[in-house]
């Protein structure tokens, strides 16, 4: 988790002198309780936008917005806690919105966005926004929460992003696997732009089984500059087991820039269909 | 202080072409990505295409994919736009952009950093 471009960061608007600061995600008003404390944030509303960084990069961005309640205890809202957590890790990044002058009521009711914190492909987060100052230990909540989960790599507006394209999502294989005589499976993908090695994982399941009954692995050497975009053909030799029929293939490419941890592309082939044949009828019927 | 001027856009017939360009000063040029966005009548503002610093790569808004090429020459610190295959729905006001820019999953720029005063493209027969 991390900031996008933190020397932008505003939050000031018509009527109200406000900054943006770090924060540790632990306000001074959990340790000193006030008295009196404000409502909780209206309407959070999280959305995925996207962001282009000073030098032109592109990043998957967490859009947060919220509105005031139009009660009184706007008179004491001195900011807000945003704070967003990774949900798979634990991990929390918070900003902390100051206000520098008091809040008026208007005609409008205060609206508050900030879309600056960057988010990872086929995460999901928890995003809240605490009012300031917190509430007494005993108080009414006044934050709002909700969860949000960002798409993967296979999403079309996520795949030019610059994280997914540092893990590979531009490269597009196109694999296709035959069943050939002899137990073989012939494997065909398309390469990459990239003098790099590429590995095919191979996993045989029985037919409606899920533990592995063969796994195999082949190391497919980096191409030359004039093989870029060709097809590239690998036959696989399976293990002669009965109903050892479905294939998983898995193509792993080892780009420079996600080396071990570029993004993985699959084929599955089925067992091929059984004749329905009908159940024998015995001859005769067994009287014991 | 940062100046971005745009010019020329014009009248155009469905079909036709124009060469947008946008003239930068009071930064270092290089050190920046840059946008073009636009502003069709009574709409927001919408993001069309970005360069990254050394125009290794470029961006596009769906519509205006294959049909918009953007550009630049830091030698010069101007950035382009060529609009080919014009649509009367491309009809706008068209401004080159700073820096970082946010929008979201509709192209709507939600925060831009710098932009200059326009150069206006009508597309009509």
């Known amino acids: 988790l991390r900031l996008l471009d933190h020397r932008a960061l505003v939050c000031s608007q018509p009527g109200l002198n406000c900054t943006v600061k770090n924060s540790t995600c632990l306000d001074d008003s959990w340790i000193h309780p006030r008295n009196l404390t404000p409502s909780s944030p209206k309407d959070l509303q999280i959305q995925l936008h996207f962001a282009h960084t000073q030098q032109g990069d592109l990043f998957p961005v967490a859009h947060i917005e919220w509105t005031l309640q139009t009660d009184a205890s706007i008179l004491y809202l001195e900011g807000a806690e945003l704070s967003v957590l990774q949900l798979n890790t634990n991990e929390r990044l918070c900003v902390r919105f100051e206000f520098l002058s008091k809040l008026r009521h208007h005609h409008r009711r205060w609206r508050f966005t900030f879309s600056h914190f960057v988010v990872d492909p086929d995460q999901e987060y928890e995003v809240t926004v605490h009012h300031l100052p917190k509430p007494i230990p005993d108080g009414d909540p006044n934050h709002q929460s909700k969860n949000f989960l960002v798409p993967d790599c296979e999403h079309a507006r996520m795949k030019v992003t610059t994280p997914c394209m540092s893990s590979g999502s531009l490269w597009d294989p196109n694999i296709t696997v035959e069943t050939l005589e002899a137990h073989q499976l012939r494997v065909s993908f398309t390469l990459w732009n990239e003098s790099t090695h590429y590995q095919i994982l191979l996993t045989s399941f029985p037919h409606m089984e899920n533990h592995s009954c063969f796994e195999h692995m082949h190391h497919i050497p980096a191409p030359r500059p004039e093989e870029f975009h060709q097809r590239s053909n690998v036959t696989l030799t399976l293990r002669n087991l009965k109903g050892c029929c479905r294939h998983q293939v898995q193509i792993q490419p080892f780009f420079s820039s996600c080396l071990n941890d570029c993004l993985r592309h699959s084929a599955t082939v089925s067992c091929p269909e059984m004749p329905d044949t009908p159940e024998p009828i015995p001859d005769y019927m067994p009287l014991w | 202080q940062v100046q971005l001027q745009e010019s020329g856009g014009g009248l155009v017939q469905p079909g036709g072409s124009l060469r947008l360009s946008c003239a930068a000063s009071?930064?270092?040029?290089?050190?920046?990505?840059m946008n073009w966005v636009r502003q069709a009548p009574g709409k927001g503002l919408e993001w069309v295409s970005n360069i990254n610093i050394d125009g290794s790569r470029t961006f596009y808004a769906d519509s205006v994919k294959g049909r918009f090429t953007i550009s630049r020459d830091n030698a010069r610190n101007t950035l382009y736009l060529q609009l080919n295959s014009l649509r009367t729905e491309d009809t706008a006001m068209y401004y080159c952009?700073?820096?970082?820019?946010?929008?979201?999953?509709?192209?709507?720029?939600?925060?831009?950093?710098?932009k200059g005063q326009g150069t206006q493209v009508t597309v009509s027969s």
């Open positions: 952009a700073k820096g970082s820019i946010t929008y979201d999953m509709d192209y709507r720029v939600t925060t831009i950093e710098e």
């Open positions: 009071g930064f270092i040029f290089s050190n920046y990505g």
